[in-house]
């Protein structure tokens, strides 16, 4: 029996700008029941205050409320693991809201296999912004990739669309059926999880010229 | 005809900033993003980043992020870039480009250049 | 960033000369690739994108190849009009970086 390892915050992420969570990885116990408390300041304040809710995001996590959610502000985040044989204490973390969003992927997504004047077959996709995006005010601004693959293939291929909310594919084989996906940025912040899957078969009776 | 016209020459002193502007004609503003690349005097392109005019997203070199700032006029179909706090070394040709409307990074049509020089 | 490395940096060549210009990427970047020529005081011209498609008006005699990481320009039969420098650039994701130029001169 001993006391805690030295707990370690994992990551803090905001879907939003308007909360946010943050994770924890637990050192060893020591082989005793322990705790853990997340206390966090706030950069410039003399204040220190504890994890204001450690249920809405699972174990081992701290979810802030738009309540607790100050943008423009750092905040110093720490974590306390305590035993009967002592206490430790993880670094500190800094933590701007602004850098840390992870929004949801993008939503509506559409696929059309449409033809040029040439005959030249493509598949026309698109896509609308995650929900919560207020894109028109500037709140935010998206980058976007798509990614497909046609069935049989093991690697997708990815394209970088910009800010861009719509793309054509080129190249593709009739009679195959190809898998899709979205995902999109923030200026700041960290690439979404790769959105639902769509799927759509290039019909044969296309015809493709290079 | 597609065509993009850029703003005449300036001579800026250090730590002064420029604005050089680039009117797009021939084509619908909105659906291309508009990139700008510099040219140092005998040395190679350099991209500094872009604006989509439909929702003014940008994209910046992370090396002139913290100086320079990428706008448009859809009124007008003009785009602008601002670059502060200049040196001697951001003496160069300033281009603007249109990308080709689905590949975000190729760039089509080119404006003339505008030769911004920095000297005390 | 991706680097982009053209060689060779500067080639003589006549007209007529079948010539080639390489570019490698320092990493995939799939067929994200352009091809652009410049001509002094002049602004750069697109001439192929996607590492082989010919931008609009581009003469047949040029032509890309290559994807992932190692990319060619060739020009079948040089003209008077080709002697210029010639840069790379990926468009695959921001930042787009170019290479350092090919300067093609008259032997």
């Known amino acids: 029996q001993s006391p805690p390892g030295k707990p370690e915050i994992h990551k803090c992420r905001s879907p939003d700008k308007e909360t946010f969570t943050c994770w924890w990885n637990p050192g060893s116990d020591g082989g005793l029941p322990t705790n853990y408390s997340l206390t966090y300041s706030k950069e410039g304040e003399k204040n220190t205050y504890e994890c204001p809710d450690y249920k809405t995001s699972g174990p081992n996590s701290c979810f802030f409320s738009k309540q607790y959610t100050s943008i423009w502000k750092i905040y110093i985040i720490t974590v306390n693991a305590t035993n009967e044989m002592g206490s430790s204490t993880s670094d500190p973390l800094y933590v701007d809201v602004t850098y840390i969003v992870e929004p949801e992927p993008p939503r509506n997504l559409t696929l059309e296999v449409k033809q040029l004047k040439d005959k030249k077959t493509y598949l026309w996709v698109k896509w609308l912004p995650p929900t919560i995006t207020d894109v028109k005010t500037g709140w935010f601004t998206m980058e976007y990739e798509i990614r497909l693959k046609s069935e049989e293939a093991d690697e997708w291929e990815i394209h970088f669309t910009g800010h861009q909310t719509q793309f054509k594919v080129f190249d593709l084989y009739p009679g195959q059926k190809y898998l899709v996906q979205t995902r999109c940025k923030p200026d700041h912040g960290y690439w979404s999880r790769w959105g639902q899957e769509k799927s759509i078969e290039i019909p044969n009776d296309f015809t493709l010229k290079d | 005809e597609v065509q993009l016209v850029q703003s005449g020459a300036e001579v800026k002193k250090p730590g002064a900033s420029v604005k050089v502007s680039c009117k797009a004609s021939g084509y619908t503003f909105t659906d291309y993003n508009i990139h700008w690349v510099r040219q140092a005097p005998g040395q190679g392109l350099e991209w500094m980043g872009y604006?989509?005019?439909?929702?003014?997203?940008?994209g910046y070199n992370q090396k002139f992020k913290s100086r320079v700032t990428m706008t448009t006029d859809t009124s007008t179909s003009t785009a602008y870039m601002e670059l502060r706090s200049l040196r001697s070394d951001d003496t160069a040709v300033y281009y603007c480009?249109?990308?080709?409307?689905?590949?975000?990074?190729?760039?089509?049509?080119w404006g003339q250049g505008t030769t911004v020089t920095v000297s005390s | 960033d991706i680097q982009m490395t053209q060689s060779p940096s500067s080639l003589s060549a006549s007209v007529g000369d079948r010539v080639t210009i390489t570019c490698r990427a320092s990493?995939?970047?799939?067929?994200?690739l352009a091809w652009y020529q410049q001509k002094p005081g002049k602004a750069p011209k697109l001439l192929v994108y996607?590492?082989?498609t010919l931008a609009e008006g581009v003469p047949s005699r040029f032509s890309g190849s290559g994807s992932g990481t190692d990319f060619t320009l060739t020009i079948s039969s040089l003209q008077p009009e080709d002697f210029a420098t010639y840069y790379c650039q990926h468009h695959y994701a921001t930042p787009f970086t170019f290479g350092q130029g090919t300067k093609l001169e008259i032997k």
């Open positions: 604006i989509y005019p439909n929702n003014d997203g940008t």
């Open positions: 480009a249109r990308g080709d409307g689905n590949y975000v990074g190729d760039m089509d049509y």
């Open positions: 996607n590492a082989k």
């Open positions: 990493e995939n970047i799939y067929s994200y």
